[in-house]
């Protein structure tokens, strides 16, 4: 007579997170009397997953009717699989007794969990930087399994090459995280630029996940100033304009000084936008020439985005 065998036909099973995993197990005999138990792992620290005899296992259902008189199929379905469920599952026949004693174990089925990476989160530097500077962007994605993953960086559709990527942990784990840092050189034209981190994984079926960062949140383009004197509008008045060009972001305050004394301060409001996303703004000052006996030094002083002020001066000749 052949002794009971516990058959686990699948050496391995791979399941997507959130789905149910079916672990197959059949026995060849109803002898001896006693329950089937399922464990994750082996040895004294093994974790009980299901006991035919007793206990409450809310995530586990038997595939066939375990109470059916001649049932020899003890396959189970585990619902709502997460990466934490990965491991080797053993179907074990016990012999009735006080206590029940282990009679025979199946060879085990390794359950691997395919878990999607989280949406990549791209973050840039804490402070803005100006063109020609190199800034670092980081990209993070978590909770994926298996470990194999591909990460790429793009700037406006052009693949970047200057980046470093780490996948943690290095050893076996239920799930993994990826962290990548890319270096990007800013140009004056980058207000509308985007940096994209793209993550490809087996669970995504060829449709990679993307995280983006807008360089508009990172770049500061300082303005160029030009002060010009307009033709005289009235006999005693001169119109002086200060052209503030190609700046970003919009936050800007302009102060007019006459011979070093503050004449007027204003904040940029009705700006015009250039194609590249930078702004232009113009401020003008009417100078009453008759009020001055000597030449007047007019200064346009601009404080942009909280940076130290830049200025441009113009000497206004006062004829006797």
């Amino acid at each position: 007579e052949e002794e009971l065998q516990v058959i686990q036909p699948d050496k391995s099973v791979s399941v997507a997170a959130g789905e149910s995993a079916i672990l197959h197990c059949t026995v060849t005999s109803l002898i001896p009397v006693g329950p089937i138990q399922w464990f994750r792992g082996a040895g004294p620290a093994r974790e009980l997953i299901y006991n035919q005899k007793e206990g409450h296992f809310p995530r586990v259902t038997t595939v066939s009717e375990s109470t059916k008189r001649e049932n020899m199929d003890f396959s189970i379905s585990i619902s709502n699989i997460t990466p934490a469920d990965a491991g080797t599952y053993y179907c074990v026949k016990f012999r009735k007794g006080s206590p029940d004693t282990e009679f025979k174990s199946g060879a085990g089925t390794e359950l691997s969990v395919r878990a999607k990476p989280s949406a990549p989160v791209v973050s840039g530097p804490a402070a803005r930087a100006t063109p020609q500077h190199t800034v670092s962007f980081t990209c993070e994605s978590h909770g994926f399994s298996p470990r194999d993953i591909t990460l790429k960086w793009f700037k406006n559709g052009n693949e970047l090459s200057d980046f470093q990527t780490n996948v943690d942990p290095v050893g076996e784990s239920v799930s993994y995280s990826i962290h990548s840092t890319a270096k990007v050189v800013l140009t004056r034209e980058d207000v509308h630029s985007q940096v994209i981190c793209e993550v490809a994984h087996v669970t995504l079926q060829g449709d990679p996940l993307r995280g983006t960062a807008n360089l508009s949140e990172t770049i500061r383009v300082p303005p160029t100033l030009e002060v010009t004197q307009q033709p005289v509008r009235a006999e005693n008045q001169v119109n002086v304009t200060c052209q503030v060009r190609k700046f970003y972001p919009q936050r800007l305050q302009l102060t007019w000084l006459e011979n070093g004394n503050v004449s007027r301060t204003e904040t940029a409001s009705t700006v015009t936008e250039n194609k590249d996303g930078t702004y232009n703004w113009m401020s003008w000052l009417l100078v009453n020439v008759s009020a001055h006996r000597d030449d007047v030094k007019l200064t346009c002083q601009v404080e942009h985005d909280g940076q130290p002020a830049v200025s441009k001066s113009h000497d206004l000749k006062v004829s006797a």
């Epitope: 052949e2 005999s29 109803l30 001896p32 009397v33 329950p35 007793e54 007794g97 006080s98």
Partner: antibody
Framework: RQLVESGGGLVQPGGSLRLSCAAS????????ISWVRQAPGKGLEYIGT?????ITYYASWAKGRFTGSKTSSTAYLQMTSLRAEDTAVYYC????????????WGQGTLVTVSS | DIEMTQSPSSVSASVGDRVTLTCQAS????????LAWYQQKPGQAPKLLIY???TLATGVPSRFSGSGSGTDFTLTISSLQPEDFATYYC???????????FGGGTKVEIK
């Protein structure tokens, strides 16, 4: 699917008897066979179960005098040192109890122990 | 060893009656559900009705039902039929493989 017992009859006190239980329609290889007896006008009494070689067990009162064995088609119950109180109808049944209950029964064979 | 006590030892009932038989174990049965019910008519072998305390055996009419757990179990016949007049036995299993014991039986007679 059925079980048919044979081997019952009259036996003297102290004597021995071997009962047979032939299965048809299924194999005994993956099933236990249990033996149950019923004294005249009394209730049912469990004797023991024959599984495989190492898996054979008996009620405490039956140990020593009753021995079971089986092939893929026939189960046997060897009874020794028989006493008058062993007089009963002996049934064989397929099953080992708990989730393997006694679902097919033989028709029973009468064993009478008397001088 | 486990001991099984059935009550009453006999009950008189009429066709159509609801009949409840009880079986009490001296200790919790194995797995709290190692309890089967058998029907026996004179001159015949027993017939399996219920196993694992509440699972109806194949081919058994649905008027038979079993319930209970641990030490106290019942067999209910919801509407007694003429063919149900018989003796009913419970079989309880203790923690040991060989510890299988029948109750004394309850005879269901015609009133």
């Amino acid at each position: 699917r059925q079980l048919v017992e044979s081997g019952g009859g009259l036996v003297q006190p102290g004597g021995s008897l071997r009962l047979s239980c032939a299965a048809s329609g299924f194999s005994l290889s993956s099933h236990g066979i249990s033996w149950v007896r019923q004294a005249p006008g009394k209730g049912l009494e469990y004797i023991g179960t024959i599984g495989t070689g190492v898996i054979t067990y008996y009620a405490s009162w039956a140990k020593g005098r009753f021995t079971g064995s089986k092939t893929s088609s026939t189960a046997y119950l060897q009874m020794t040192s028989l006493r008058a109180e062993d007089t009963a109808v002996y049934y064989c049944a397929r099953g080992s109890a708990w989730n393997d209950p006694f679902d097919y029964w033989g028709q029973g064979t009468l064993v009478t122990v008397s001088s | 060893d486990i001991e099984m006590t059935q009550s009453p030892s006999s009950v008189s009932a009429s066709v159509g009656d609801r009949v409840t038989l009880t079986c009490q174990a001296s200790q919790s049965v194995y797995g709290n559900n190692d309890l089967a019910w058998y029907q026996q008519k004179p001159g015949q072998a027993p017939k399996l009705l219920i196993y694992l305390a509440s699972t109806l055996a194949t081919g058994v009419p649905s008027r038979f039902s079993g319930s209970g757990s641990g030490t106290d179990f019942t067999l209910t016949i919801s509407s007694l039929q003429p063919e149900d007049f018989a003796t009913y036995y419970c079989l309880g299993g203790g923690d040991d493989e060989a510890d299988n014991v029948f109750g004394g039986g309850t005879k269901v007679e015609i009133k």
